[in-house]
Interface confidence: low
Amino acid sequence: DPASKSRSCGEVRQIYGAKGFSLSDVPQAEISGEHLRICPQGYTCCTSEMEENLANRSHAELETALRDSSRVLQAMLATQLRSFDDHFQHLLNDSERTLQATFPGAFGELYTQNARAFRDLYSELRLYYRGANLHLEETLAEFWARLLERLFKQLHPQLLLPDDYLDCLGKQAEALRPFGEAPRELRLRATRAFVAARSFVQGLGVASDVVRKVAQVPLGPECSRAVMKLVYCAHCLGVPGARPCPDYCRNVLKGCLANQADLDAEWRNLLDSMVLITDKFWGTSGVESVIGSVHTWLAEAINALQDNRDTLTAKVIQGCGNPKVNPQGPGPEEKRRRGKLAPRERPPSGTLEKLVSEAKAQLRDVQDFWISLPGTLCSEKMALSTASDDRCWNGMARGRYLPEVMGDGLANQINNPEVEVDITKPDMTIRQQIMQLKIMTNRLRSAYNGNDVDFQDASDDGSGSGSGDGCLDDLCSRKVSRKSSSSRTPLTHALPGLSEQEGQKTS
């Protein structure tokens, strides 16, 4: 149409200027389009420089849109992580504060002389919750062993108790159960509760980390060309009012985000596992019940030791022989009053229920985040035409868009008409993140079954969100006792069911 040759470029000038580019680049009227590299080569209002500028801009706009969507998801996960983390830490801190407030009155010097041992137990529980690679059963065993040694000495100040006698005491302890059932109960419940709590919080951290890293994956040059064609070629070709056809937009973004869609299966698995493990937050072995009540097990243990003192002493003497009397030592300790026990079952505050129901709802909402991303970006960011519009922009002109919409993921882009995707070259960053999701899901599944797993940090570059510090100086791969004196056997017998560990660790 000869008239179209002299069509004004006023609308393009307006749009181009609004993007912050120089208006001197824009022709007054349409020119021949042989110079175009991305848009169809009809008459055009775009010079080569304009096409390049708009291609760069469309690429940046898509990356921004992608990052914005990711940021919303990251913020949600970070908020969840903070809320749960605060709650779990608060439970443990509350338990420790209760212990510090009540034990001096309840147990006198039996507590004050050993306050640091109790405090260190809480420190180790905190470290364990935060993902340190330490063995909780062993940590508890060492605590009980050490506590028994110290309390036995305190209860018998009139006796000389050399190292070899204390070793013998440690060996007897497994059979004697000096602290009653408390150590066994605490071990069973604490392992399940802490592993559930920390794996859930770590799951949130890994999910957030994956989103952050995937949002940084750059879009390739083929994607840039396709997005330019989708968003700005209509302007260049003099049909600025035409909106992209919905299926055309989906195909472009499915091609651009093919690798991201491959996260879908493992992302769903992770979120399912996280929802599932919240079942472990309830009941007598649940997180709230156990973490907030550590001090009550400790009180029960000391009471049991005091109640059993005479029997225990007799049996120890029977097994280890008569210890020498300390001529300088005072008489035997007076039998102490029992420490009053707070009720073991903490009444649920309702905080955790609220947190869990919110988390479940939000995690379900974002389950299909990766495969719905092309559709979401098209509908929210691309000003699409309606589905019934047969005069939408189809990449060549105004008209219907005929190709079928591609499936999700890299493999399904083999015949994508809009983006040339090399399906033999998956993005390595995204493959690594798929691996991280798998690892975390396996941890959650183990945790659901009550199994402790080696919680080294799941992130590949060490920048994860609080999911553990890997090797924490003296807590690294703790498979041996804290005792280091060459003349001593590690005391790991105070907890029924744990055999003596081999080897010794220097402090």
Partner: antibody
Framework: EVQLQQSGPELVKPGASVKISCKAS????????MHWVKQSPEKSLEWIGE????????TYNQKFKAKATLTVDKSSSTAYIQLKSLTSEDSAVYYC???????????WGQGTLVTVSS | QIVLSQSPAIMSASPGEKVTMTCSAS?????MYWYQQKPGSSPRLLIY???NLASGVPVRFSGSGSGTSYSLTISRMEAEDAATYYC?????????FGAGTKLELK
């Protein structure tokens, strides 16, 4: 490797305040108590107090309660001691020391010399 | 507070000689801790829980004692052992240190 890196020496005027830092690395900062110890020629080593980096809870030596304030910044894994109303008696080397589980200062900072002089 | 008194304040020993220094507490403590400090350096943990050797400490060092009386022994003095040695208690607040024993090489 566990490291405690303290800030550099300070020369301050009587009556002023000073804030010394102790940056921790190589371990989980919130997992262990941090202590501060004063060393002066006259008084040997004196324990100032301790802070639980996880909760911010502190315990002070009564003698230093009005003199020292212990704080932490979890985000940078740094512990701080602020000393106020300084006099010549506060001139000393101040150490941060990290507890290792079960009662011991296994790790020490390199010390920060504070000199109070007009 | 528990006061720890170290004696002697200053002592000297020849290489190969056995060295013993003591730390007396004003009231009974559960365990004693010993630190070594050389001029210009931070204290270094030697002995914890009265008799346990800290990591990397030579076996010529040993600790013993109970109640109010504790001691640190070097079985054979070496030149590198010349330093000031401090005892410390954790049994009650405030934590306290002894005034130190300065060990010189004869």
């Amino acid at each position: 490797e566990v490291q405690l890196q303290q800030s550099g020496p300070e020369l301050v005027k009587p009556g002023a305040s000073v804030k010394i830092s102790c940056k921790a690395s190589g371990y989980s900062f919130t997992g262990y108590y941090m202590h501060w110890v004063k060393q002066s020629p006259e008084k040997s080593l004196e324990w100032i107090g301790e802070i639980n980096p996880s909760t911010g809870d502190t315990t002070y030596n009564q003698k230093f309660k009005a003199k020292a304030t212990l704080t932490v910044d979890k985000s940078s894994s740094t512990a701080y001691i602020q000393l106020k109303s300084l006099t010549s008696e506060d001139s000393a080397v101040y150490y941060c020391a990290r507890e290792r589980n079960y009662d011991r200062f296994a790790y020490w900072g390199q010390g920060t010399l504070v000199t109070v002089s007009s | 507070q528990i006061v720890l008194s170290q004696s002697p304040a200053i002592m000297s020993a020849s290489p190969g000689e056995k060295v013993t220094m003591t730390c007396s507490a004003s009231s009974s403590v559960s365990y004693m801790y010993w630190y070594q400090q050389k001029p210009g350096s931070s204290p270094r943990l030697l002995i914890y829980d009265t008799s346990n050797l800290a990591s990397g400490v030579p076996v010529r060092f040993s600790g013993s004692g109970s109640g109010t009386s504790y001691s640190l022994t070097i079985s054979r003095m070496e030149a590198e052992d010349a330093a000031t040695y401090y005892c410390q208690q954790w049994s009650s607040y405030p934590l306290t240190f002894g005034a130190g024993t300065k060990l010189e090489l004869k």
